[in-house]
Interface confidence: medium
């Protein structure tokens, strides 16, 4: 807390100019008033404050906006959003994109603090949904935002709004994000041709069910190893070794590296052992033959 | 990639005067405030003086206050350190630095002796 | 006379953990941040942490800060021979004829 301490002569500031630099922390709570400070906050960013001095600017707009700030003070707050808390975060009401990206920009090359979590999250929620200007935004200052949300949050995203997803964007989903996001990006691609579907929809099919991903394996997609590694275990399973050979193409080969990782291990294992061997790659642990193969899952759905 | 570079310094008589200069580059000059630190032989640092982005605007240590000034030239991205009525005591290396207390680049330093 | 108080010097072997105090008053450390600068002899000063305890980039996470009251202290873990050099806290003093004061420094010798 800085000491209230009467202004010295000749220093009282008649606007936020660069002079201010030189002032003590004590000189500025004296010689600044807060509603100037206010009025003139796109000025603060183009002066170099020390960080001391910030925490007093800060101080005197807390003292100002006890409720939270104006978002024409917060449009403008630059550098000084480094020091605003969660909690000062979640006083204020932000609407305006231009005001989030100004906010993140500040922030940017730096991982998502907790600040910024704060105001995201107080962004979104303000909007009711994820729309695609703000994933626009987001995904573009952090790849992985999309990854950080829960799937109920996930939920609220519209599927015009997957158009903005890249690649990258989905590289630390879990499979139970990938559940909620897949669903609506087939629904966004569904009017596309079969070859373009498919460059879009690869990043998703790790929430692909298996009817799916028997569709793709009809429409000569060559799917690569690291997709296929990323595709859900369960949906996997019930695939035949022609169905996995056509959804692969080419890339069937890379089987035999990864026989010992899921989802691959647990496939082979639900395979004869004389289909694997049609693929000429040597994968073993398959059902030998002669052995007959119960669907118990099968069964309990018919009695 | 930020550059610093000092020149200006050598032998000078007590009472005398001396210019210092620091070349920058790497950055937008006009948009950080500078300051001169100085260090004597074997000694700590100091702070000297300090000068805002525009040039309007400066700041010296008591110790030199009267007797230094600093200026800057923007369009040729140049801070100077003017030099009067020197002392043995201003025996020093004289460190360009960008910031005015988060000193985060240095120049290598031009060394000032004042000596009779 | 520094206004902030550092031990002349302090040693310690590889792989150590070294500890530097700065001393201040309520003027400079206690109502300001704090800096620590690293220098080799013959060198200009290197910025090795700002705002009490924050890194700039490039600089390992062997080396901390930290700040309680009015003294701070500048950590080094896994000491390395490397790290054999001067270091300087510093801090914005807000008394009436201060702006930036300096530690005397405190020399570092890795055994």
């Known amino acids: 807390e800085v000491e209230k301490t009467a202004c010295p002569s000749g220093k009282k500031a008649r606007e936020i100019d660069e002079s201010l630099i030189f002032y003590k922390k004590w000189e500025l709570e004296a010689c600044v008033d807060a509603a100037l400070l206010a009025t003139q906050m796109d000025r603060v960013n183009a002066i170099p404050f020390t960080y001391e001095q910030l925490d007093v600017l800060k101080h005197k707009l807390d003292e100002l906006y006890p409720q939270g700030y104006p978002e024409s003070v917060i449009q403008h707050l630059g550098y000084l959003f480094l020091k605003m808390s969660p909690e000062d975060i979640r006083k204020w009401n932000v609407t305006s994109l231009e005001t989030l990206k100004a906010l993140l920009e500040v922030n940017k090359g730096h991982e998502m603090s907790p600040q910024v979590a704060t105001l995201i999250d107080r962004f979104v929620k303000g909007r009711g949904q994820l729309d695609k200007d703000t994933l626009d935004t987001l995904t573009a200052f952090y790849p992985g935002y999309l990854c950080s949300l829960s799937p109920e949050e996930l939920s609220s995203v519209p599927p015009s709004s997957i158009w903005a997803v890249r690649p990258q964007d989905l590289d630390t989903c879990d499979p139970r994000q990938l559940d909620v996001l897949y669903p609506k990006a087939r629904l966004a691609f569904q009017n596309m041709n079969g070859s373009e579907y498919f460059v879009k929809i690869q990043s998703f099919l790790g929430g692909a069910p298996t009817e799916d991903l028997k569709a793709l394996s009809q429409q000569n997609v060559s799917m690569d190893l690291a997709t296929f590694m990323k595709l859900r275990t369960d949906a996997v399973l019930p695939l035949t070794v022609a169905e996995v050979q056509k959804l692969l193409g080419p890339h069937v080969e890379g089987l035999k590296a990864e026989e010992r990782h899921r989802p691959v291990r647990d496939w082979i294992l639900r395979q004869r052992q004389d289909d694997l061997d049609t693929l000429g790659l040597g994968l073993q642990g398959g059902i030998p033959n002669g052995y007959l193969v119960l669907d118990l899952s099968m069964q309990e759905a018919l009695s | 990639e930020v550059h610093l570079v000092e020149s200006g310094g050598g032998l000078v008589q007590p009472g005398g005067s001396l210019r210092l200069s620091c070349a920058a580059s790497g950055f937008t000059f006009s948009s950080y405030a500078m300051s001169w630190v100085r260090q004597a032989p074997g000694k700590g640092l100091e702070w000297v003086s300090a000068?805002?982005?525009?040039?309007?605007?400066?700041y010296y240590a008591d110790s030199v206050k009267g007797r230094f000034t600093i200026s800057r030239d923007n369009s040729k991205n140049t801070l100077y350190l003017q030099m009067n009525s020197l002392k043995t005591e201003d025996t020093a290396v004289y460190y360009c630095?960008?910031?005015?207390?988060?000193?985060?680049?240095w120049g290598q330093g031009t060394l000032v002796t004042v000596s009779s | 006379q520094p206004v902030l108080t550092q031990p002349p010097s302090a040693s310690g072997t590889p792989g150590q953990r070294v500890t530097i105090s700065c001393s201040g008053s309520s003027s400079n450390i206690g109502s300001n941040y704090v800096y620590w600068y690293q220098q080799f002899p013959g060198t200009a000063p290197k910025l090795l942490i700002y705002?009490?305890?924050q890194r700039p980039s490039g600089v390992p996470d062997r080396f901390s800060g930290s700040k309680s009251g009015t003294s701070a202290s500048l950590a080094i873990s896994g000491l390395r021979s490397e790290d054999e050099a001067d270091y300087y806290c510093a801090a914005r003093d807000d008394s009436l004829s201060g702006y930036v004061t300096f530690g005397g420094g405190t020399k570092l010798t890795v055994l």
């Open positions: 630095t960008r910031g005015v207390a988060t000193f985060d680049y």
């Open positions: 705002m009490n305890n």
């Open positions: 000068i805002s982005g525009s040039g309007g605007s400066t």
